[in-house]
C-alpha cells in the first residue's frame, strides 16, 4: 500500500477547514504535533488535530448523522404524512356528502320531517366524523340514536299528522316502541353492520398511517451513542488530521460504520415489513361494506328504504302503537293515507356523476404500491445513509478510518477498528428504549390490522342474507351498488371518483407530464428516493 502523503507542514488547510466549523483558531496547532492526548484519531505520526478539535468533530459528526438520517427518511415521511392528510380530508368530505345526500333525500321526499330530521342527521354524521378520528363512540349507539330520534317525528308527522300538540309527550314511548316493534325492520341492523365495519376499517387505516409517521419520527430523531460518534468522527474527520482534505471514506467502510451505528434501528425492519404487508391486506379488503365511501354515500338510500318500510306497515303499526302508548295519548288518530307519488322519485335523486378517474380506493392502492417500495427501508438504512454522504466511488483511493488506501478491505478495517473499540460490543447493546417502544406499537398495530383484515369470499354477505336482505349482484367490474334493498337502490358510477372538492387542492395543472419529458425515471434515485407521485393530482 502507498505511504501516506507527507502531512501539511503548517496545518494551514486544516486550520482553514476547522474555522468553518468553529470560528477562532485557538484549538488548531500551527504545525503538526505528536497528538498523544487524542482518543479517536489516533495518529501514526505527527497530526494537525488537538483533543478539543476531536471533541468538536465528534459533535459535528453526530449532528451530521442526525441530518443524514432525516434526509434518508425524507421522502417516506412526506409520502405518509401527505397521504394521511389527504385521506383524513377526503373522509371528512365523504361524511359531508353523505350528510348532504341524506338531507336532500328528506327534503325531496319527506319535507314535513325537516328540520328535525336535519338535526338528527347532522348529529349522526358528526359522531361518524369523530369516530373516524379516534373518538370513543359506539357505532351501534349512533345508529340506534338516529332511528330512535327519527321515529317519533315520522310517527307524528307522517303516520299521524293530525296528532294534537297535547299528545306529543309520547316521544319516549315511541322511542321505546321503535326497538320493541322493530318498526324499521332489519334496516337499522343492516346500517349498523355496514357503518361499523366500514368505519372501523377507516379508523384503523388512519391510525396505522399516523403510527407510520410516529415510527419514522422516532428513528428520525434518534440520539447516537458516544461510540457511534467516535466511529463517525474517524470516518469523516480523522483524515483531516493528516492533511487529507479531499479524501472520501470508502463506501464499504461507510456501510460497516453505519451498520454499527444503526444496529438498534435495523431491528425495526421485521415489524416495519409486517406493517406494510398488513396495511396492504387491509386496503385490499376495503371494498363494498368495508369501504366507507361506498357505505356512507349509500346511506340516504337505505334510510329512505327504512322509512318506506315503516310506511308500508303504517296501518298495523299505528294500531299497535296506539295501544302501547295509549296512556300518553288522549285518543287514537287515523293513519294518514299515502298516495303513490309520495314514494321516492328516482329521477329527483340522481347523484351527480363526477368525472374523476381517481377514487379513494385507487388512491389507497397507489399509496400501498409506493409504501411497498420502502418495505426494506430499515434494513437498507445504513446503505441509504452512505448514499447520502460523500463516499468514494468504487472503493478506490479512499479513507478506511486509519489511512488512505488504494482498495478497501473490510477485514483490515475491522481489525483497525477493534484496536479502538469493539464494533461487536456496539451491536450487542440492543435497541434504544425509544426504539423498543416503537417496536411494541408496531406489533400492536400489526395485530389490529391482521384482525381487521377482511374475510375472504362472501362470508359477511351470507350473514346479511340470513337477515332477509339481498346482498345484490354487484360484481367487481360493475358499477358499485349503493343502498340496501331493491326499491331504494341507486347506482352511482364509481362513487364520487375521489371527490370533486379535493380536485382544486391537488393542483390539477401541476401534473407531472406538464413538462418537457415524461415523469423522470432515475434509477439511482429509485433505490431510495422513489419519486412516486406522493400526492398525485387528479388525472
Amino acid at each position: 500500500q502507498p505511504p501516506p502523503p507527507p502531512p501539511d507542514a503548517t496545518c494551514h488547510q486544516v486550520r482553514s477547514f476547522f474555522q468553518r466549523l468553529q470560528p477562532g483558531l485557538k484549538w488548531v496547532p500551527e504545525t503538526p504535533v505528536p497528538g498523544s492526548d487524542l482518543q479517536v484519531c489516533l495518529p501514526k505520526g505527527p497530526t494537525c488535530c488537538s483533543r478539543k478539535m476531536e471533541e468538536k468533530y465528534q459533535l459535528t459528526a453526530r449532528l451530521n448523522m442526525e441530518q443524514l438520517l432525516q434526509s434518508a427518511s425524507m421522502e417516506l415521511k412526506f409520502l405518509i404524512i401527505q397521504n394521511a392528510a389527504v385521506f383524513q380530508e377526503a373522509f371528512e368530505i365523504v361524511v359531508r356528502h353523505a350528510k348532504n345526500y341524506t338531507n336532500a333525500m328528506f327534503k325531496n321526499n319527506y319535507p314535513s320531517l325537516t328540520p328535525q330530521a336535519f338535526e338528527f342527521v347532522g348529529e349522526f354524521f358528526t359522531d361518524v366524523s369523530l369516530y373516524i378520528l379516534g373518538s370513543d363512540i359506539n357505532v351501534d349507539d349512533m345508529v340506534n340514536e338516529l332511528f330512535d330520534s327519527l321515529f317519533p317525528v315520522i310517527y307524528t308527522q307522517l303516520m299521524n299528522p293530525g296528532l294534537p300538540d297535547s299528545a306529543l309527550d309520547i316521544n319516549e314511548c315511541l322511542r321505546g316502541a321503535r326497538r320493541d316493534l322493530k318498526v324499521f325492520g332489519n334496516f337499522p341492523k343492516l346500517i349498523m353492520t355496514q357503518v361499523s365495519k366500514s368505519l372501523q376499517v377507516t379508523r384503523i387505516f388512519l391510525q396505522a398511517l399516523n403510527l407510520g409517521i410516529e415510527v419514522i419520527n422516532t428513528t428520525d430523531h434518534l440520539k447516537f451513542s458516544k461510540d457511534c460518534g467516535r466511529m463517525l468522527t474517524r470516518m469523516w474527520y480523522c483524515s483531516y488530521c493528516q492533511g487529507l482534505m479531499m479524501v472520501k471514506p470508502c463506501g464499504g467502510y461507510c456501510n460497516v460504520v453505519m451498520q454499527g451505528c444503526m444496529a438498534g434501528v435495523v431491528e425495526i425492519d421485521k415489524y416495519w415489513r409486517e406493517y406494510i404487508l398488513s396495511l396492504e391486506e387491509l386496503v385490499n379488503g376495503m371494498y363494498r361494506i368495508y369501504d366507507m365511501e361506498n357505505v356512507l354515500l349509500g346511506l340516504f338510500s337505505t334510510i329512505h328504504d327504512s322509512i318506506q318500510y315503516v310506511q308500508k306497515n303504517a296501518g298495523k303499526l299505528t294500531t299497535t302503537i296506539g295501544k302501547l302508548c295509549a296512556h300518553s295519548q288522549q285518543r287514537q288518530y287515523r293513519s294518514a293515507y299515502y298516495p303513490e307519488d309520495l314514494f321516492i322519485d328516482k329521477k329527483v335523486l340522481k347523484v351527480a356523476h363526477v368525472e374523476h378517474e381517481e377514487t379513494l380506493s385507487s388512491r389507497r392502492r397507489e399509496l400501498i404500491q409506493k409504501l411497498k417500495s420502502f418495505i426494506s427501508f430499515y434494513s437498507a438504512l445504513p446503505g441509504y445513509i452512505c448514499s447520502h454522504s460523500p463516499v468514494a466511488e468504487n472503493d478506490t483511493l479512499c479513507w478506511n478510518g486509519q489511512e488512505l488506501v488504494e482498495r478497501y478491505s473490510q477485514k483490515a478495517a475491522r481489525n483497525g477498528m477493534k484496536n479502538q473499540f469493539n464494533l461487536h460490543e456496539l451491536k450487542m447493546k440492543g435497541p434504544e428504549p425509544v426504539v423498543s417502544q416503537i417496536i411494541d406499537k408496531l406489533k400492536h398495530i400489526n395485530q389490529l390490522l391482521r384482525t381487521m383484515s377482511m374475510p375472504k369470499g362472501r362470508v359477511l354477505d351470507k350473514n346479511l342474507d340470513e337477515e332477509g336482505f339481498e346482498s345484490g349482484d354487484c360484481g367487481d367490474d360493475e358499477d358499485e351498488c349503493i343502498g340496501g334493498s331493491g326499491d331504494g337502490m341507486i347506482k352511482v358510477k364509481n362513487q364520487l371518483r375521489f371527490l370533486a372538492e379535493l380536485a382544486y387542492d391537488l393542483d390539477v395543472d401541476d401534473a407531472p407530464g406538464n413538462s418537457q419529458q415524461a415523469t423522470p425515471k432515475d434509477n439511482e434515485i429509485s433505490t431510495f428516493h422513489n419519486l412516486g407521485n406522493v400526492h398525485s393530482p387528479l388525472k
Epitope: 441530518q67 443524514l68 432525516q70 434526509s71 425524507m74 421522502e75 415521511k77 412526506f78 409520502l79 404524512i81 401527505q82 394521511a84 392528510a85 389527504v86 383524513q88 380530508e89 399516523n210 409517521i213 419520527n217 447520502h388 454522504s389 460523500p390 379535493l502 382544486y504 387542492d505 391537488l506 393542483d507 401541476d510 407531472p512 413538462s515 418537457q516 419529458q517 423522470p520 432515475d522 439511482e524 434515485i525 428516493h529 419519486l531 412516486g532 407521485n533 406522493v534 400526492h535 398525485s536 393530482p537
Partner: antibody
C-alpha cells in the same frame, strides 16, 4: 389559485423574539409542507426548515435550531415562524414557500416575503 | 452540508440569444435539483423541478439538464423579462441548500 400572504415588514430592536406569519389559501393547507427561507443582502438564500401542517412535524437546518421555531394553526391555514434572540445578523427578508404536493416539486409557491430589520 | 456552486455571478446576454447557467454540487445529488427565478423586488418563482421538469406556466424556452453533480439551466431565445437572478436548489440532503445565484443582465 395558490396564495401565500405574509405579514408586513418589521423594524425591531435586538432582543427576545419576533413572530411572522404566512396565510395560505387556494389549496389544502394540511397536505403540503411549508418551508421557510432566509434571504440576506438581497442575494444569499438559506433554507431554515420545514413543517408538516398535518401534524406539526418539523425538520430544521441545524444552523437555525434554537434561532427559529416553526408552528402552524390549521384552523386559520396559517404558518408561523418565531425568530428568537434577535441580533443584527437576523436582518433579512424571510419567505414562506409551499413544498409541492408531488414530492419532487420542491418549493413551488412562495410568499411575498417579510422584511425584518433588527437595529438598536 | 452540500455546497451548490454557481460559478458565474453575472452573465450578460442579448434578447434572442441562448444562455446557459450552471450549478455544481459538492457531492452527488442525483436529480434532486430545482431552479428558481427572482426578479428585482419580487419573491422567487419556481421554474424547474427534478432537474428537467418545468413547473406549470413556465415558458418552454426554459430547459433544465444534468445529473449527479453538474446541472444547467438553459434559456433559449432570451426575452427582456428574463432579467433576474437565477438560483439552483438541492433537496437530496438536509439541510436543503441553494446556489449563490447568477444575475442575468440584458445588454
Amino acid at each position: 389559485e395558490v396564495q401565500l400572504q405574509q405579514s408586513g415588514p418589521e423594524l425591531v430592536k435586538p432582543g427576545p423574539s419576533l413572530k411572522i406569519s404566512c396565510k395560505a389559501s387556494g389549496y389544502s393547507f394540511t397536505v403540503s409542507p411549508m418551508t421557510w427561507v432566509k434571504q440576506s443582502h438581497g442575494k444569499n438564500l438559506e433554507w431554515i426548515g420545514l413543517i408538516h401542517p398535518y401534524n406539526g412535524d418539523t425538520t430544521y437546518n441545524q444552523k437555525f435550531k434554537g434561532k427559529a421555531t416553526l408552528t402552524v394553526d390549521k384552523s386559520s391555514s396559517t404558518a408561523y415562524m418565531e425568530l428568537l434572540s434577535l441580533t443584527s445578523e437576523d436582518s433579512a427578508v424571510y419567505y414562506c414557500a409551499r413544498w409541492g404536493n408531488y414530492y419532487p416539486y420542491a418549493m413551488d409557491y412562495w410568499g411575498q416575503g417579510t422584511s425584518v430589520t433588527v437595529s438598536s | 452540508d452540500i455546497v451548490m456552486t454557481q460559478s458565474q455571478k453575472f452573465m450578460s446576454t442579448s434578447v434572442g440569444d441562448r444562455v446557459s447557467i450552471t450549478c455544481k454540487a459538492s457531492q452527488n445529488v442525483r436529480s434532486t435539483v430545482a431552479w428558481y427565478q427572482q426578479k428585482p423586488g419580487q419573491s422567487p418563482k419556481a421554474l424547474i423541478y427534478l432537474t428537467s421538469n418545468r413547473h406549470t406556466g413556465v415558458p418552454d424556452r426554459f430547459t433544465g439538464s444534468g445529473s449527479g453533480t453538474d446541472f444547467t439551466l438553459t434559456i433559449s431565445n432570451v426575452q427582456s423579462e428574463d432579467l433576474a437572478d437565477y438560483f439552483c436548489l438541492q433537496h437530496w440532503n438536509y439541510p436543503y441548500t441553494f446556489g449563490g445565484g447568477t444575475k442575468l443582465e440584458i445588454k
